[in-house]
């Protein structure tokens, strides 16, 4: 004969546990129904009556099957440096993430406490590691034979084009310039971007030629979008 199905509330067999989506109520000493996500326990069960559930009020939620007396409060509205990627509903908390071009510099238990704008790599340097939702951009000097002429949080160093006849040699922040005859092959048809979760846009510049092919920590600054390495006050 099949075992009889017990309806909540019921007293569990000694040594056994309550079934899925049930909990053991210590006061009633019975297995009782949990409330579904989006609800909470309005009235706890007794020996003769099951849990009475009610919907979460506005701006509150429960994400799991539960028997909490009150729903959890949704987090405060997203601050100006963040965007809401998940709305507050009866079944889930609001999730805020840093807006495009920013990353979470200081996190908290759930979400981000403070966002900061991503760093960019200056001409002569390319992105070694792109920014993510929780980490800043890492830059590296462009190796000999490669260049970056942008101030960007996505552009990597790319190879100089190879010329039949070189008019101006390339350096770390400028592509080689070929004579009017076309190059044997162009190794750098366009800026190369690293994929990354934060949407970014690079700015291209026309820097003046530099004397060296690889940057040092004191390389000449191109005109265009690169402020000086010094803390200039423009006096």
């Amino acid at each position: 004969l099949p075992a009889q199905v017990a309806f909540t509330p019921y007293a569990p067999e000694p040594g056994s546990t309550c079934r899925l989506r049930e909990y053991y109520d210590q006061t009633a000493q019975m297995c009782c129904s949990k409330c579904s996500p989006g609800q909470h326990a309005k009235v706890f069960c007794t020996k003769t009556s099951d849990t009475v559930c009610d919907s979460c009020e506005d701006s509150t939620y429960t994400q799991l099957w539960n028997w909490v007396p009150e729903c959890l409060s949704c987090g405060s509205r997203c601050s100006s440096d963040q965007v809401e990627t998940q709305a507050c509903t009866r079944e889930q908390n609001r999730i805020c993430t840093c807006r495009p071009g920013w990353y979470c510099a200081l996190s908290k238990q759930e979400g981000c406490r403070l966002c900061a704008p991503l760093r960019k790599c200056r001409p002569g340097f390319g992105v070694a590691r792109p920014g993510t939702e929780t980490s800043d951009v890492v830059c590296k000097p462009c190796a000999p034979g490669t260049f970056s002429n942008t101030t960007s949080s996505t552009d990597i160093c790319r190879p100089h084009q190879i010329c039949n006849v070189v008019a101006i040699p390339g350096n770390a922040s400028m592509d080689a310039v070929c004579t009017s005859t076309s190059p044997t092959r162009s190794m750098a048809p366009g800026a190369v971007h690293l994929p990354q979760p934060v949407s970014t846009r690079s700015q291209h510049t026309q820097p003046t030629p530099e004397p060296s092919t690889a940057p040092s920590t004191s390389f000449l600054l191109p005109m265009g979008p690169s402020p000086p390495a010094e803390g200039s006050t423009g006096d």
Partner: antibody
Framework: EVQLVESGGGLVQPGGSLRLSCAAS????????ISWVRQAPGKGLEWVAY????????DYATWVNGRFTISLDNSKNTLYLQMNSLRAEDTAVYYC??????????????????WGQGTLVTVSS | DIQMTQSPSSLSASVGDRVTITCRAS??????LAWYQQKPGKAPKLLIY???DLASGVPSRFSGSGSGTDFTLTISSLQPEDFATYYC????????????FGGGTKVEIK
């Protein structure tokens, strides 16, 4: 030479308006986040507003309360601060300031490595 | 809103002295802190960023330390050109921010 030059300051009556300009040479504002920072006479530095042109985002100190607007004219490579409903307590030297370009190849918008010379705004009747 | 509190507000020192200025953040800001020097009638100048990194062209007698909420700017041997006002700044200027800068510390000649 890389520099920022502010202009547009002067004497204005309470409740009046003023538009400050910050012209850049040697850098392209469209690539950089840039702020306005002010300093009342004999007082400390106070951040006012920030614009990050790449992403079209602007931020203001909470006390601004919608009275000021930061904007950028890319064609002129000039930053503006439109100030309305001015009060006596807005009297200050206003600086534009851009991020820090380190010798290790970073441009970091979090810190102010490049400053203009400042322009004085006096709000008085 | 993160509050930045500097101390002392002013100090007197002599050339050659070791000078220490402190800055306290109202909440943990890890190492996102900068120090500036400002002389009368001039714009501020960045000295230290990321709490301890020396900005380009800044003399090595300036150093920064600390993380979390407590930070220090040290001038190992004060020079005549170092008499100025010094400010700390946290790196999070957004619409939640007011006191991005500390109140300043004026270093005067004793």
């Amino acid at each position: 030479e890389v520099q920022l030059v502010e202009s547009g300051g002067g004497l204005v009556q309470p409740g009046g308006s003023l538009r400050l300009s910050c012209a850049a040479s040697g850098i392209d504002f469209s690539s950089y986040g840039i702020s306005w920072v002010r300093q009342a006479p004999g007082k400390g530095l106070e951040w006012v507003a920030y614009i990050y042109p790449d992403y079209g985002s602007t931020d203001y100190a909470t006390w601004v309360n919608g009275r000021f607007t930061i904007s950028l004219d890319n064609s002129k490579n000039t930053l503006y601060l439109q100030m309305n409903s001015l009060r006596a307590e807005d009297t200050a030297v206003y600086y534009c300031a851009s991020g820090y370009a380190s010798s290790s190849g970073y441009y970091d918008p979090k810190y102010f490595g490049l400053w203009g010379q400042g322009t004085l705004v006096t709000v008085s009747s | 809103d993160i509050q930045m509190t500097q101390s002392p507000s002013s100090l007197s020192a002599s050339v050659g002295d070791r000078v220490t200025i402190t800055c306290r953040a109202s909440e943990d800001i890890e190492s996102y802190l900068a120090w500036y020097q400002q002389k009368p009638g001039k714009a501020p100048k960045l000295l230290i960023y990321d709490a301890s990194d020396l900005a380009s062209g800044v003399p090595s007698r300036f150093s920064g330390s600390g993380s979390g909420t407590d930070f220090t700017l040290t001038i190992s041997s004060l020079q005549p050109e170092d008499f100025a006002t010094y400010y700390c700044q946290h790196g999070f200027y957004t619409s939640r921010s007011d006191s991005v800068f500390g109140g300043g510390t004026k270093v005067e000649i004793k």
